[in-house]
């Protein structure tokens, strides 16, 4: 074969945001009959030749980027996508709420609110059985997400997480949950929690609607400003780690 | 794959437990394999106790952390366990079995030995 | 620690009948439960892992189910050897509890 080898998958089994102390296993996946895997941290000296690192507790030393690659015969790979290994429950939980409240009509306006009693800069939403979380950067000890013109498919669950920009990997718990409910439509939700993520989100940003690839990264945008997403049909396995997407502010 | 169990069979109460699980057909030293203990007292629920991994990890139940002890001699495929200062509340069927990450479940289990604490 | 809460304590179903038994995380466990049965005097036998994943050897009338917070195992057509005791397990960081279990009798 002419050329490099086409580049493996890498997996973080069930989530790439994992409480600390509880498992999680990265997963290696190239073509069959591999020869060699190597899977990394980057930013340390850290690696191992086997296609899984199994973690039977997280620690904060372990959160970070993660990839891999393959070797068949003397021809390695590309490496795999980059894998961002959050730990969470770092930090204490910020406080989630909504403005003007969490009963919303549909076609209204209503603003998250994530709030921390620390001088975090950072921020991620995520709604519960969405691919991944929406990130907003400020230099506050709050952050707004914004959702202008609600839908149906904006009812369901939200927690938001805090962290430092000093420490991307190290995140806070989670909030409490926080239930959006839309009136005024029955049209039911576009997905239930109990489903699994719908593979990709669309991001146009001159309409302000997210986009992001379904792959076990966690994604920064930093002009988005509302979290209208917009399932699409893929390819991509919805495997059975729930996945997370972001948003920028 | 076979584990077996080991034990005193009686012990008077504030004495220490010692446990011996020995086993075959598997490695300690084997990536991502671990061994852990789970009792059951008669006509009861089963609870788990501790748990140690190839990389000599190791996890407690919480509520009976500062009595436990696990240990392992992976050249001789045995995996220990100590509990001390016992009462008649420890009398029970103890159990070790075999856990592969990959599975996340206890696969194979030793056929258990009994506890009885009695003054 | 996660609470694993199962249900009935007990049942008792005749021979060719299908029971569910479920089992309830306390938070979020994934898929990472595994079920288990036992017959008096014996060790516990690996049914399910994975929630929904079939151990070896064990027939294709018992199916495991569910992910996050709740579970089921469902025997369909019983059999006069699924008589006995079961219980759930989670994996989804120590301590790896137990639920209290579920007695099958025959009716």
């Known amino acids: 074969q002419s050329g490099p080898l086409p580049k493996p998958s890498l997996q973080a089994l069930p989530s790439s945001l994992v409480p600390l102390e509880k498992p999680v296993t990265l997963r290696c996946q190239g073509p069959p009959g591999v020869d060699l895997y190597r899977l990394e941290k980057l930013s340390s000296s850290r690696y191992q030749d086997q296609a899984v690192l199994f973690i039977p507790a997280m620690k904060r030393s372990l959160a970070g980027r993660y990839r891999c690659s393959y070797q068949n015969g003397s021809l390695w790979s590309l490496p795999s996508d980059q894998l961002e290994l959050v730990a969470t429950g770092v930090f204490a939980k910020p406080s989630l709420s909504a403005q003007p409240g969490p009963a919303v009509s549909s076609g209204g306006d209503v603003t998250l609110q994530c709030q921390t009693r620390y001088g975090f800069d950072q921020f991620a939403l995520y709604k519960e059985g969405d691919p991944a979380p929406y990130k907003n950067p400020e230099r506050w000890y709050r952050a707004s997400f914004p959702i202008i013109t609600v839908t149906a498919a904006h009812s369901g669950t939200y927690r938001c997480y805090s962290f430092s920009s000093r420490d991307p990997y190290l995140w806070s718990a989670p909030s409490d949950p926080l239930e959006l409910v839309v009136t005024g439509t029955s049209v039911t939700p576009s997905r239930l929690p109990t489903e699994p993520p719908s593979p990709v989100a669309e991001f146009s940003e001159a309409t302000a609607e997210l986009t992001v690839s379904f792959t076990n990264e966690v994604f920064t945008t930093e002009t988005s400003r509302s979290i209208t997403a917009s399932p699409k049909e893929s390819d991509s396995p919805a495997g059975p780690a729930r996945q997370y997407y972001t948003k920028g502010n | 794959v076979t584990l077996k169990e080991s034990g005193p069979g009686i012990l008077q109460p504030s004495q220490t437990l010692s446990l011996t699980c020995s086993f075959s057909?598997?490695?300690?030293?084997?990536?991502?394999?671990?061994v852990g203990w789970i009792r059951q007292p008669s006509g009861k629920g089963l609870e788990w106790l501790a748990h140690i991994w190839w990389n000599d990890d190791k996890y407690y139940n919480t509520a009976l952390k500062s009595r436990l002890t696990i240990s392992k001699d992976t050249s001789n495929n045995q995996v220990f366990l100590k509990i001390a200062s016992v009462d008649t509340a420890d009398t029970a069927t103890y159990y070790c079995?075999?856990?592969?990450?990959?599975?996340?479940?206890?696969?194979?289990w030793g056929q258990g030995t009994t506890l009885t604490v009695s003054s | 620690d996660i609470q694993m809460t199962q249900s009935p304590a007990s049942l008792s179903a005749s021979v060719g009948e299908t029971v569910t038994i479920t089992c309830r995380a306390s938070?979020?466990?994934?898929?990472?439960l595994a079920w288990y049965q036992q017959k008096q005097g014996k060790s516990p036998q690996l049914l399910v892992y994975?929630?929904?994943n079939l151990a070896d050897g064990v027939p294709s009338r018992f199916s495991g189910s569910g992910s996050g917070t709740q579970f089921s195992l469902k025997i369909n057509s019983l059999q006069p050897e699924d008589f006995g005791s079961y219980y759930c397990q989670h994996f989804y960081g120590t301590p790896w509890t137990f639920g209290g279990g579920t007695k099958l009798e025959i009716k």
């Open positions: 938070e979020n466990i994934f898929s990472i």
């Open positions: 057909g598997f490695s300690l030293s084997t990536y991502g394999i671990g």
């Open positions: 994975a929630a929904t």
């Open positions: 079995a075999r856990v592969y990450y990959y599975g996340s479940s206890f696969d194979y």
